[in-house]
């Protein structure tokens, strides 16, 4: 706010006031004496840069009066009172009343004094984020969406990751006059490294305190990545009975595990049981390829593992044996 | 109804002071300031001053300043201007009046410096 | 001083007609602005304040508009009553100061 003037009557009032769409706004204005000054208001106005005549009046005999007087109103100014408070009301805010208004006393003897007041009429949009569901492109596609609807002005969308990504952001009218719906994408090559992290959508707007944090898990569909895990290249005959997995990552998950080998069926020494095969005692070197093949909605995936079962000493940590 | 009443005719001589009254009725005196204007038929309306009888603060046109001198009296609810030192220029119906801030004027005395 | 000059002086009119009556000020104003009608031998009379509003008991055919420095008052259906001198007054800066009136006649 200015501040007081020193020796003459001075106007207070915000160089600025928000309001909110279709809500009601106070234009808050006041008339500052100092201690030693006297000054008599006669009048109260109100008008709007740029249009002809005023938009409400407070006089002293006469009392208020308005351009549309179902939308204005002088929140203190009282008939057969002091008129030292010209704040003016205003009802359902629309777009186009947003500008630079005056509001001017006219007083004695010091004469008329004025202030400008910028009136921003804004609109709070309501923002959502949602997970674009990919699959394995080799090319960059949206990965995320975010969405602010209905803003006054349009809402300010950034990303916050560590996976990299570029933002491709648009904007339209919103459904009320005056207000932009902001989209914004968070575009990146999809992997499977990707899936399962998140995302953070930013957005900022004068209407709020804080900005909004949304947060996005993202999703990328792709077909198993198969890997087989268990065998240490230290199995050796007459050791313990052993446990080989199928470690399979995918989107969706895994349908199906099928054990074989090059040779085609899994000997009798190999017993599938879903992820994971066991491997029993066996009493002569073996050396197959064993390969796991996994399933899911998208196709299937195999991994390989060469197994040697050799002859030497069993150690008491490794190796297959019969109890 | 508000009535501002003033002396209808003043003849006075050159070189002399002349005090027109202008008694308020029908709305509280106080509240609002009251203001003299003088109309000829060379000049038109002409502002002179205004004082606010509730405080007693006046204000001047630069021309009129030496003049005129402005009071009021509370009590009997009267505001007064004091011509001095008149010449015939000063020849001119003299008004009190709320002006914009009510409808009514006085009836206007007019002065004669002869 | 501001100054308001006001036009025409003089202006001839028939019963019904519409008329208007221009002020401009020397610098902005903004709506304070009054006008006055002065019957002959009467005071004048308050028609209009803040440059649009009128006082209550003037008909609405007399109409204030302007801001700034442009000033108009209209009439309209003229009456035979409205035969008058009418006058503006800006009221934003002391000394006030009053347009030199235009004299509104019959044909």
């Known amino acids: 706010w200015p501040p007081p003037g020193t020796g003459d009557v001075v106007v207070q009032a915000p160089t600025q006031v928000p309001g909110f769409l279709g809500d009601s706004v106070t234009l808050p204005c006041y008339l500052q004496v100092p201690n030693m000054e006297v000054t008599h208001v006669s009048q109260l106005t109100w008008a709007r840069h740029g249009e002809s005549g005023s938009m409400a009046v407070f006089h002293q005999t006469q009392g208020p009066s308005y351009s549309e007087s179902k939308r204005l109103e002088f929140v203190a100014a009282r008939l057969g009172a002091e008129l030292r408070n010209a704040s003016l009301r205003m009802f359902g805010l629309r777009v186009e009343d947003e500008g630079n208004y005056t509001c001017l006393f006219v007083t004695f003897p010091q004469g008329s004094r004025s202030v400008d007041i910028w009136l921003r009429v804004l609109a709070k949009p309501q923002n959502t984020a949602e997970v674009q569901k990919v699959q394995l492109t080799g090319e960059p596609v949206p990965m995320a969406r975010c969405v602010s609807t209905g803003g006054r002005p349009p809402a300010q969308i950034t990303w916050h990751s560590d996976l990299g990504g570029m933002p491709n952001t648009s904007q339209v009218p919103g459904f009320l006059s005056g207000t932009v719906t902001v989209t914004s994408l968070w575009i990146l090559v999809p992997s499977s490294q990707v899936d399962g992290k998140n995302v953070t959508c930013k957005v900022e707007h004068e209407s709020f305190e804080k900005p909004q944090l949304l947060t996005v898990n993202l999703t990328v569909y792709y077909p198993p990545e198969v890997s087989i895990s268990g065998y240490d290249n230290n199995w050796y005959l007459g050791q313990n009975e052993a446990t080989l997995t199928c470690d399979a990552r995918s989107n969706p998950e895994p349908t199906g595990y099928n054990w074989s080998t090059t040779m085609g069926p899994l000997p009798p020494f190999a017993v599938a049981q879903g992820a994971q095969l066991l491997i029993r005692p066996v009493d002569k070197p073996i050396n197959t390829t064993l390969i796991c093949n996994v399933t899911n909605a998208l196709g299937a995936r195999q991994a390989e593992l060469t197994v040697q079962v050799k002859e030497g000493p069993p150690s008491e940590h490794s190796g297959i044996s019969r109890n | 109804q508000v009535q501002l009443q003033q002396p209808g005719a003043v003849l006075v001589r050159p070189g002399a002071s002349v005090k027109l009254s202008c008694k308020a009725l029908g709305y509280t005196f106080t509240d609002h300031e009251m203001h003299w204007v003088r109309q000829t038929p060379v000049h038109g309306l002409e502002w002179i001053g205004a004082?606010?009888?509730?405080?007693?603060?006046?204000a001047y046109n630069q021309k009129f300043k030496g003049k005129a001198t402005l009071t009021a009296d509370k009590s009997s609810s009267t505001a007064y201007m004091e011509l001095s030192i008149l010449t015939s220029e000063d020849s001119a119906v003299y008004y009190c009046?709320?002006?914009?801030?009510?409808?009514?004027w006085g009836q206007g005395t007019t002065l004669t410096v002869s | 001083d501001v100054v308001m000059t006001q036009t025409p002086k003089f202006m001839s009119t028939s019963v019904g007609d519409r008329v208007s009556v221009t002020c401009k000020a020397s610098?902005?104003?903004?709506?304070?602005v009054a006008w006055y009608q002065q019957k002959p031998g009467q005071s004048p009379k308050a028609l209009i304040y803040s440059a649009s509003y009128r006082y209550s008991g003037v008909p609405d055919r007399f109409t204030g508009s302007g801001s700034g420095t442009d000033f108009t008052l209209t009439i309209s259906n003229v009456q035979s009553e409205d035969l008058a001198d009418y006058f503006c007054q800006q009221y934003n800066t002391y000394p006030l100061t009053f347009g030199a009136g235009t004299k509104l006649e019959l044909k």
């Open positions: 610098q902005n104003v903004g709506t304070n």
């Open positions: 009046t709320p002006l914009w801030l009510r409808r009514d």
């Open positions: 004082i606010h009888p509730g405080s007693g603060v006046t």
